[in-house]
Interface confidence: medium
């Protein structure tokens, strides 16, 4: 019968021939009278076969990642006779593992967005990345991941690649993050290869701004002969916020004469100082009111950041007509 | 510190002019509106005349318009009263005030400057 | 335009007595319009309460005000030594007026 033990050639040998093993018959009394014959693919060009003693080596380098195994088939003549010595027998050639190939991140590029203010250990994102190697080979292609950019506020789980925010952050500081993302094969023993990729985060805005009126004081005119809902100046706050988190509603908080009313422009996002009532010079040449601005949508969990409505002063001059 | 100094005042007659100076330092001038208020010896307040933060809008008491003149640099941290025409009745201790931001009452006034108006 | 009589014109007390000063205005004023100065001689004046009731950075709290429309009053609680001068209101409504003054003296 056939004897051999299991064949395995490691990948990427550099020298011209390496020894794999031995196929023999248990018939062989090594005098050479019988001749080992290798077939099939392979045989020949990376393969070949000593034909007296059946040693088999591998000429050429060896990819596992491109072929991880090969099936060859040994036969086995008697010189003399001509005639197979035992049946011809299939075999396999294993390539082994060695650790050539660095993790790739197959699903470049990543992007996430997440809201601002979000807390600690909220999910961002997970990355994946991908080793040529064999799994079931030691640690080749097992991998770590690490934070190579993106501290203090993310953080990446080591087995799973999975981001989260290890640190509040607001958006009106800074609206979009680059997180540099590391894997290393090898579980980051030496020897180890590794591969990056780049996570770009936005932040999405939550209404955590209130509106803030641009001045504390404004001075506006009107003339005795303006009638009712003449439009006598406009005020204007700003919001660090943007969309509808940055909508606003003026009014009035304080009017003692009833005179003045503030209307919104929803497009501008200014208030506009109404004249309610007319004005005499005679009677009153200079009126004060205080006006205040507020969002238009704040979600019951932002109110927090929405206490104290911002105020201003608006001291508004009567101007004299000549009256007939 | 945060103070006004009125300064030009003496005596001038009938007819005459002068005009006044009020030095402002310690503050932003140029975000306050400022006034001229005058008292006649041994009598109450008379408000004068106001000029708004920029400049853009004066007024006057009826007793002066016309005849003095509100204006202001603020480049030069400086409030002025220019006084023509000038009448007996004009004799006065002139301050200058700051409004404050939330009103027309007056939380700053300088020392006084006594402009004498006789033949 | 709105005249402000303000009286008496001479209060005469003692230190550590009351004050009361009556401010009446010849048409109604908003009392968010309504302000009191002290005037010291050979000084200006300092504002001590505006709108009416609210004091002024740095005065004591021995200075209120209060009234509304045409009635305003300045009350000193306690009379101190440095008190004694002359007070002024002053409407700032409709233009700028003051009343003519109320001295208050030692006894």
């Known amino acids: 019968g056939w004897v051999w033990n299991q064949f395995f050639v490691p990948e990427e040998m550099n020298t011209t021939s390496h020894h794999i093993g031995q196929l023999r018959s248990d018939l062989d009394n090594g005098n050479n009278s019988f001749q080992y014959k290798l077939l099939g693919a392979g045989a020949g060009s990376t393969f070949i076969i000593d034909e007296r003693t059946g040693d088999i080596y591998a000429i050429q380098k060896l990819d596992r990642e491109e072929r991880s195994l090969y099936i060859l088939r040994a036969q086995v003549i008697d010189i003399a006779t001509g005639r197979a010595v035992e049946p011809e027998s299939e075999f396999v050639i294993k390539v082994s593992d060695i650790n050539d190939n660095e993790p790739k991140f197959l699903d470049e590029p990543y992007e996430a967005i997440v809201p601002e203010m979000s807390p600690e250990g909220t999910l961002v994102i997970q990355v994946t990345a991908s080793d040529a190697d064999d799994p079931s080979s030691g640690n080749n292609a097992r991998l770590l991941y690490s934070l190579l950019q993106g501290q203090p506020y993310f953080s990446v789980e080591p087995t799973t690649g999975v981001i989260r925010i290890s640190s509040k952050m607001d958006r009106e500081l800074q609206d979009e993050y680059w997180v540099i993302i590391q894997a290393k094969d090898m579980i980051g023993q030496p020897g180890a290869l590794s591969g990056t990729t780049s996570v770009l985060i936005k932040l999405s805005d939550v209404n955590d701004n209130k509106p803030i009126f641009k001045e504390s004081l404004y001075r506006l005119t009107v003339s005795e002969s303006a009638p009712t809902g003449t439009s006598i100046g406009t005020i204007m706050a700003y919001d660090n916020d943007i969309g509808e988190n940055a909508e606003m509603d003026y009014s009035i908080e304080e009017d003692d004469s009833q005179t003045f009313d503030i209307i919104t422009n929803h497009e501008t996002q200014e208030g506009i100082v109404i004249l309610k009532k007319k004005v005499d010079f005679e009677h009153q040449n200079h009126y004060g009111i205080r006006a205040k601005v507020k969002n238009h949508h704040v979600p019951e969990q932002l109110m927090k950041y929405h206490t104290e409505a911002s105020t201003t002063f608006i001291k508004i001059q009567v101007e004299d007509v000549d009256e007939p | 510190q945060v103070q006004l100094v009125e300064s030009g005042g003496g005596v001038v007659q009938p007819g005459g002019s002068l005009r006044l100076s009020c030095a402002a330092s310690?503050?932003?001038?140029?975000?306050?509106?400022m006034d001229w208020v005058r008292q006649a010896p041994g009598k109450g307040l008379e408000w004068v005349a106001v000029?708004?933060?920029?400049?853009?809008?004066?007024y006057y008491a009826e007793s002066v318009r016309g005849r003095f003149t509100i204006s202001r640099d603020n480049s030069k941290n400086t409030l002025f009263l220019q006084m023509n025409s000038l009448r007996v009745e004009d004799t006065a201790v002139y301050y200058c005030a700051r409004e404050t931001g939330e009103g027309w009452y007056f939380d700053l006034w300088g020392q006084g400057t006594l402009v004498t108006v006789s033949s | 335009e709105i005249v402000l009589t303000q009286s008496p014109g001479t209060l005469s007390l003692s230190p550590g007595e009351r004050a009361t000063l009556s401010c009446r205005a010849s048409?109604?004023?908003?009392?968010?319009?309504l302000a009191w100065y002290q005037q010291k001689p050979g000084q200006a004046p300092r504002l001590l309460i505006y709108?009416?009731?609210s004091r002024a950075t740095g005065i004591p709290d021995r200075f209120s005000g209060s009234g509304s429309g045409t009635d305003f009053t300045l009350t000193i609680s306690s009379l101190e030594p440095e008190d004694f001068a002359v007070y002024y209101c002053q409407q700032y409504g409709s233009s700028w007026t003051f009343g003519q003054g109320t001295k208050v003296e030692i006894k």
């Open positions: 048409q109604s004023v908003s009392s968010s319009y």
């Open positions: 000029i708004w933060y920029e400049g853009s809008n004066k």
């Open positions: 709108g009416a009731s």
């Open positions: 310690g503050f932003s001038f140029s975000s306050y509106d």
